[in-house]
Structure formats: C-alpha cells, structure tokens
C-alpha cells in the first residue's frame, strides 16, 4: 500500500508529421497510470491508450477521420495499486492539451525526389507523392490528395560544378526546368503550404544529382 499521491500530467504536446499524430506528456509515471481522451469541439470524448504507463498515445486513428476539425485531448491520471488519489470529491485528475488542427498544423514530412529525366535541355523532376494515413472510401490518400493546391513544392537546383542555386515552384508534383546541355545538375525539394502561419515548410529532401541512378537521359 503506497502513499505517493497521484499527479496530473503536464507538458501535453502534439507531435504530428504527415498526419501521423502522437500526443506526448510528462511525467514518467510513479504509482500511477494514464488514460487519454480525444474530442472535437462539437464531438464526444473518446478514450484511447487505456491504463497505460507510457507517456505518449498514438491518436492518428481518431484525427484522420476529419483532418480539418480542431481536436482537444486530455490525459487522466489514475492511482496504480492501492495508492491514494488527489482528485477532489472523487473526481479524476486530468490535464487538457492545446487545441490541434491537423490540416493546419501537422508537420510536412521530408519529401523525396522520385525521379528526374533529361530530354535535351529540359529536365523533368518528379516528387514522390507520399501516402498518408488519411482514408477516403477505404483507401489511403496521398499528401497531394489531402492538401490539393494548398501544397506546393519548391525545387532547388544547381550545376554540380558551381554553388549558385536556382529555384522553381509547382503546385503539382512535377517540375520542368531548363538546363544547360552537357552540364550535370543537383536537385533538392521542399514541401510548402504558403497559406499556413505555422509549420509552413518541410525540411529539404536528400540531394539527388544527375549521373546517379535516379536519373534518365535522352537526346
């Protein structure tokens, strides 16, 4: 039988990339467990991660039901074993998370250059359209299908022999750029949602250079 009182969770933080969404909190539990609830502003509280000793809970399954909704989570603390609870009048201790709107706030994952193809003095660069965990009619949607024209990609490209970078933008997943014949170029892309106020840009993709496996060259 213990005497350590139950404490409320704190530092509730949303960690979300391409809609994969995890709620994290502190402290590591001592003689207590947690249960998480999630709700939309107009919806009901749904419990997840029951009686867990983890300090994180994957809420992806709930938020992908409607990524444009605003969600709130709360973390309940319950005494483990025969430990006293500090809740007043038998009410359980809980702490609310900040609000979270996946469509506006999920981080954009690092993009990947799928391929590039040179035809004469033109190069077509294709960005991989990553699949998300957002479903529609039973199938998983890609990032482009979720964000549509809200999502743009910025291409950074430069001659292998120099450091001067050029940029191009597209609201599809393809770029068609002019290059100098006989020169090798390197490419990196970044996902951007210009309309956002936070988490507007992804990290840059890995650099891909002509003359390596991903490229194709045709006269």
């Amino acid at each position: 039988s213990g005497t350590t009182n139950t404490v409320a969770a704190y530092n509730l933080t949303w960690k979300s990339t391409n809609f994969k969404t995890i709620l994290e909190w502190e402290p590591k539990p001592v003689n207590q467990v947690y249960t998480v609830q999630i709700s939309t502003k107009s919806g009901d509280w749904k419990s997840k991660c029951f009686y867990t000793t983890d300090t994180e809970c994957d809420l992806t399954d709930e938020i992908v039901k409607d990524v444009k909704q605003t969600y709130l989570a709360r973390v309940f603390s319950y005494p483990a074993g025969n430990v006293e609870s500090t809740g007043s009048a038998g009410e359980p201790l809980y702490e609310n998370s900040p609000e979270f709107t996946p469509y506006l706030e999920t981080n954009l994952g690092q993009p990947t250059i799928q391929s590039f193809e040179q035809v004469g003095t033109k190069v077509n660069v294709t960005v991989e359209d990553e699949r998300t965990l957002v479903r529609k009619n039973g199938t998983f949607l890609t990032l482009r299908q979720v964000f549509g024209k809200d999502l743009i990609y910025t291409l950074y490209y430069w001659k292998s022999s120099s450091s001067g970078k050029k940029t191009a933008k597209t609201n599809t997943n393809e770029f068609l750029i002019d290059v100098d014949k006989g020169e090798n170029y390197c490419f990196s892309v970044q996902a951007v949602i210009p309309s956002r106020t936070v988490n507007r840009k992804s990290t840059d993709s890995p650099v891909e250079c002509m003359g390596q496996e991903k490229g194709e060259f045709r006269e």
Partner: antibody
C-alpha cells in the same frame, strides 16, 4: 484453445482474506490485460480492477481500494486476486476476464468459469 | 462513476420475435460500450463491442447501435437458446461500469 481456469470455491469467515487464482493458456499472457469482475447472488456484474500482466501494474475501482490486491506470475501465466477484511456482502462469484486487445479495447472476450466465495460466520 | 441504466429489467417474448434492450449512459461515453450474454450458472459471453461490432462467432441476429448516450441491443429473431440475462458495459471512463441487466424469457 484460449481459456482461463480459476481456483475452486472458498468459504471464509468475516475479517479473513481470500486469494483466487486464474491460469491463462492458449495465448500470449503478457499481451492482454486481465480484469476481475464479481457477481453477488442474483445481482449484476461489478468491475473490481485490472492488471497488466507484462508489467504487473494494477488499477482498482475505488470501492475496493485498500482491500484488493491483484498480482501475476508470468512463469505460470497466472493472475491472482486477493480480497481482505471480508464481510458478508463480499459473498459472490468472482470472475477473471481477459480484455484489452487492440480491436476490442476494454471488452472482456474470454472469461474464467468463476469462483464462488462465501463469507459466513 | 458513470451510471448505466438498462431497461427493461426483464421481458418475455415469443420465439421469432424481435427483442430490443436499451442502455442509457449518465454522460457521453462515445461508442465505448459492450454487450454481454449470461446464461444461468455460466460466465458472461461477449456479443457486441464498441456499440455495434459483432464479436467473432456470434450469430448475426444480434446487433447493437448508438444514438448519443442511448444504446440499443437487438435480437432480430428470438431463439430458444437466447434465454439469458444481457448486460451492457461502458469503458470510456474509470471505473468500468455495467448496466443492471435484462432477463430475457420465452413466452
């Protein structure tokens, strides 16, 4: 097949303690929570608490806090429920029930056969 | 604690009848509700989980639905082997709680 086998009936005096066992077989013991539920004669079902067999963490209904202790022995895939300071109103059938799979969160999909505990002076 | 008010407490119906049992939660429990069948002298058996999902191996004449805090359990065509007591159980809030039960008998 998946089953939970409980220990036999007990008769106890008021103030005594009883310890009921529940042996699991046919599945990975550590992967599912175990619950204890009791049923007084002619009455409904009452949840007592839960034990996570992988770490031994327990959570009890407040009504039983301080009187109940749930433990487990991973080497024999057995969980135990001990209830102390027995009184006549603790006379009931005590069930262990498996729960906590990812599909059916806290639904009790497998039950023990029940252990009748009679508290009488 | 969340109160689960189950009604009726007992009912008598004929073989082939449609039987409906309701369970009302004292506050919002989302779809975190299960239904069990308990035959005399036996342990309960899970029939429906998460308000409307049929447990594997359970006959399709059993079904469940939700409307807000009201939950309905239906036997579409009562069979003699369905004589039992039926319980709802919520798990959205600690502690987990059961309804008082509905005893189903054959006329």
């Amino acid at each position: 097949q998946v089953q939970l086998v409980q220990s036999g009936a007990e008769v106890k005096k008021p103030g005594a303690s009883v310890k009921v066992s529940c042996k699991a077989s046919g599945y990975t013991f550590a992967n599912y929570y175990m619950h204890w539920v009791r049923q007084a004669p002619g009455q409904g079902l009452e949840w007592m608490g839960i034990i996570n067999p992988s770490g031994g963490i327990t959570v009890y209904a407040q009504k039983f806090q301080g009187r109940v202790t749930m433990t487990r022995d991973t080497s024999t895939s057995t969980v135990y429920m001990e209830l102390s300071s027995l009184r006549s109103e603790d006379t009931a059938v005590y069930y262990c029930a498996r729960g906590g799979s990812k599909v059916a969160a806290l639904a009790f999909d497998i039950w023990g056969q029940g252990t009748m505990v009679t508290v009488s002076s | 604690d969340i109160q689960m008010t189950q009604s009726p407490s007992s009912l008598s119906a004929s073989v082939g009848d449609r039987v409906t049992i309701t369970c009302q939660a004292s506050q919002d429990i989302s779809n975190s509700l299960n239904w069990y069948q308990q035959k005399p002298g036996k342990a309960p058996k899970l029939l429906i989980y998460d308000a409307s999902n049929l447990e594997t191996g359970v006959p399709s004449r059993f079904s469940g639905s939700r409307s807000g805090t009201d939950f309905t359990f239906t036997i579409s065509s009562l069979q003699p082997e369905d004589i039992a007591t039926y319980y709802c159980q919520q798990y959205n809030f600690h502690p987990l709680t059961f309804g008082g039960g509905t005893k189903v008998e054959i006329k």
